[in-house]
């Protein structure tokens, strides 16, 4: 039975040209995290594999930095970066947990972080 929950940074906003940290945290499970994928809609941004390290998609390598931890730092933000981001945790023996973050990139300097909050996790067994 999958008992874990994914906690994320929730809905966040940032200024155009700035940077933002996307962060998820898996709790309430003893499952081992083997890999975390970061995706923007259906596009792969990065993979952090426990044994192999990071793979940053070549399309994003100039403005995506690994970390901190299993998180991802997006740099040189544009308004086109606005949208949904997903952290997909592959775990053993539980299976897959998915967290969602919504990022809004703003033109002005009124960007501020949304409160950290927990979202329901989506999962499926393999």
């Amino acid at each position: 039975m999958m008992t874990g929950t994914i906690e994320t940074t929730g809905n966040i906003s940032a200024e155009k040209g700035g940077s933002i940290i996307l962060q998820c945290h898996l709790s309430s499970t003893t499952a081992q995290v083997t890999q975390v994928n970061w995706e923007q809609q259906d596009q792969l941004l990065a993979i952090c594999n426990a044994d192999l390290g990071w793979h940053i998609s070549p399309s994003f390598k100039d403005r995506v930095a690994p970390g901190p931890g299993l998180g991802l730092t997006l740099q040189s933000l544009t308004v086109n970066d606005t949208g949904e981001y997903f952290c997909i945790y592959h775990t053993y023996p539980d299976g897959t947990y998915t967290g969602r973050i919504f990022l809004e990139v703003l033109e002005s300097s009124v960007a501020e972080h949304g409160a950290r909050f927990q979202i329901p996790h989506h999962h499926h067994h393999h």
């Epitope: 594999n49 192999l52 390290g53 070549p58 390598k61 100039d62 053993y92």
Partner: antibody
Framework: EVQLVQSGAEVKKPGASVKVSCKAS????????MHWVRQAPGQRLEWMGR????????KYNEKFKSRVTITVDKSASTAYMELSSLRSEDTAVYYC????????????WGQGTTVTVSS | DIQMTQSPSSLSASVGDRVTITCRVS??????LAWYQQKPGKSPKLLIY???TLAEGVPSRFSGSGSGTDFTLTISSLQPEDFATYYC?????????FGPGTKVDIK
């Protein structure tokens, strides 16, 4: 056109070291990780390790960790694989291979470098 | 290490035949499996990654399926240039490992 051009065949004595080069062209060298894979005669492919040409960070197969060093020269768009303490079982074709867009597989391969270890 | 097995180890087929090669993995690798084609004296060529995604420039007669521990490469109608050895590889953990290969030759 993506091209990975490797250095020529080598014959080495047991205990020696070999350094194989892989010159990349047709893409931005620092945007793609590079792998090294070998294939002994009649055997399956065997992964040795990978490197991020941008940071120089590398990961190795534990089997080779004490003997293999993967490096890059960013200015020359070239990756290198050095294997030390050679033994006859290291006789193989050594390939460099570019990591794909979506994970740890390899989408383009060099032509291979034959390394023969013989006394 | 993740163990990879392939079956059959070799097969004989004719042009136009449908060919199926199986790759079995010792543990769950989700869909992180690639297939390569290698001809004698040549470098491997990527055919499929993420179990079912066709690599750029690969003919549509090649297809991949499966997830978890069982995977299949299918060639829907074998062509003369398809006679080669096919390897599966997981791309999920260290070390990355390859199957022993399946040699497809002319009947």
């Amino acid at each position: 056109e993506v091209q990975l051009v490797q250095s020529g065949a080598e014959v080495k004595k047991p205990g020696a070291s070999v350094k194989v080069s892989c010159k990349a062209s047709g893409y931005t060298f620092t945007n793609y990780y590079m792998h090294w894979v070998r294939q002994a005669p009649g055997q399956r492919l065997e992964w040795m390790g990978r490197i991020d040409p941008d940071s120089g960070g590398s990961k190795y197969n534990e089997k080779f960790k004490s003997r293999v060093t993967i490096t890059v020269d960013k200015s020359a768009s070239t990756a290198y694989m050095e294997l030390s303490s050679l033994r006859s079982e290291d006789t193989a074709v050594y390939y460099c291979a570019r990591e794909g867009h979506y994970g740890f597989y390899s989408d383009y391969w060099g032509q291979g470098t034959t390394v023969t270890v013989s006394s | 290490d993740i163990q990879m097995t392939q079956s059959p180890s070799s097969l004989s087929a004719s042009v136009g035949d449908r060919v199926t090669i199986t790759c079995r993995v010792s543990e769950n690798i989700y869909s992180y499996l690639a297939w390569y084609q290698q001809k004698p004296g040549k470098s491997p060529k990527l055919l499929i990654y993420n179990a079912k995604t066709l690599a750029e420039g690969v003919p549509s007669r090649f297809s991949g399926s499966g997830s978890g521990t069982d995977f299949t490469l299918t060639i829907s109608s074998l062509q003369p240039e398809d006679f080669a050895t096919y390897y599966c590889q997981h791309h999920y953990g260290n070390p990355l490992t390859f199957g022993p290969g399946t040699k497809v030759d002319i009947k």
